[in-house]
């Protein structure tokens, strides 16, 4: 799977995680920090 960094405009998109762009799927994806979940890593679940 080819990945790259998200565009600059997505800098604040992931609240507690890193935004990566999945080139083959044409999708931005939030890779959440441990303890966080949700599309934008907005939920703390511990």
């Amino acid at each position: 799977v080819s990945i790259t960094k998200c565009n600059s405009d997505m800098n604040g998109y992931c609240l507690h995680g890193q935004c990566i762009y999945l080139v083959d799927m044409s999708q931005n994806y939030c890779r959440c920090e441990v303890g966080y979940t949700g599309v934008r890593c907005e939920h703390f679940y511990l």
């Epitope: 565009n7 405009d9 604040g12 998109y13 609240l15 044409s26 999708q27 599309v39 934008r40």
Partner: antibody, heavy 116, light 106 residues
């Protein structure tokens, strides 16, 4: 299926304000950014600004600063664009556009006519 | 703000011709460029995103390329249904559209 349904056409007098709504269904606007784009008759596409409904943060194109206000009501899954001090050059079709995880998905557009 | 200079503003070509449109960004946009097709009275239709990723259902005669500040959109063999206005959009840092290219049949 995902949808962005915009409010109906408006006719306004110069100097007045207009507020266009954009109701989302099939997805949560908190997972997205909502952008606003306009197109005057026979002219090109122009980005106006956007809101992050989760953080309630907005960014505007410089030329619209102070005249446009983009808001979002996450309880009704609806975004709004209000443009004040209308002039004839603001006659255009206004589109809301979802961005975020997937690439842009457009509403059907709202025609705003400014005429005395 | 990033500026997008699109050229030409209009062109006339014959059916079957290769058509090329360019967009130049005022700074590096890291391949975050999309191309839209718009026909009169219709909303814009997304053809390509991330420089060269064709949207589902878009014919393979449409393609895109480029990097840094210079990007190209190509129709390999112009068809009558391709008559429209085409716009580039940079979405690396906020958003800026190019001025558009009106494509007509000769």
């Amino acid at each position: 299926q995902d949808q962005l349904v915009q409010s109906g056409a408006e006719v306004k007098k110069p100097g007045a304000s207009v507020k266009v709504s954009c109701k989302a269904s099939g997805f949560n606007i908190k997972d997205t950014y909502i952008q606003w784009v306009r197109q005057a008759p026979g002219q090109g596409l122009e980005w106006m600004g956007r809101i992050d409904p989760l953080r309630r943060q907005t960014k505007y194109k410089e030329k619209f600063e102070g005249r446009v206000t983009i808001t979002a009501d996450t309880s009704t899954n609806t975004a709004y664009m209000e443009l004040s001090s209308l002039r004839s050059e603001d006659t255009a079709v206004y589109y809301c556009v979802r961005s975020g995880r997937e690439f842009d998905f457009w509403g059907q557009g709202t025609l705003v006519t400014v005429s005395s | 703000d990033i500026q997008m200079t699109q050229s030409p503003s209009s062109l006339s070509a014959s059916v079957g011709d290769r058509v090329t449109i360019t967009c130049k960004a005022s700074q590096d946009i890291h391949k975050y460029i999309a191309w839209y097709q718009q026909k009169p009275g219709q909303a814009p239709r997304l053809l390509i995103q991330y420089t060269s990723t064709l949207q589902p259902g878009v014919p393979s005669r449409f393609s895109g390329s480029g990097s840094g500040t210079d990007y190209t959109f190509t129709i390999s063999s112009l068809q009558p249904e391709d008559i429209a206005t085409y716009y580039c959009l940079q979405y690396d840092n906020l958003r800026t559209f190019g001025g558009g290219t009106k494509v007509e049949i000769k």
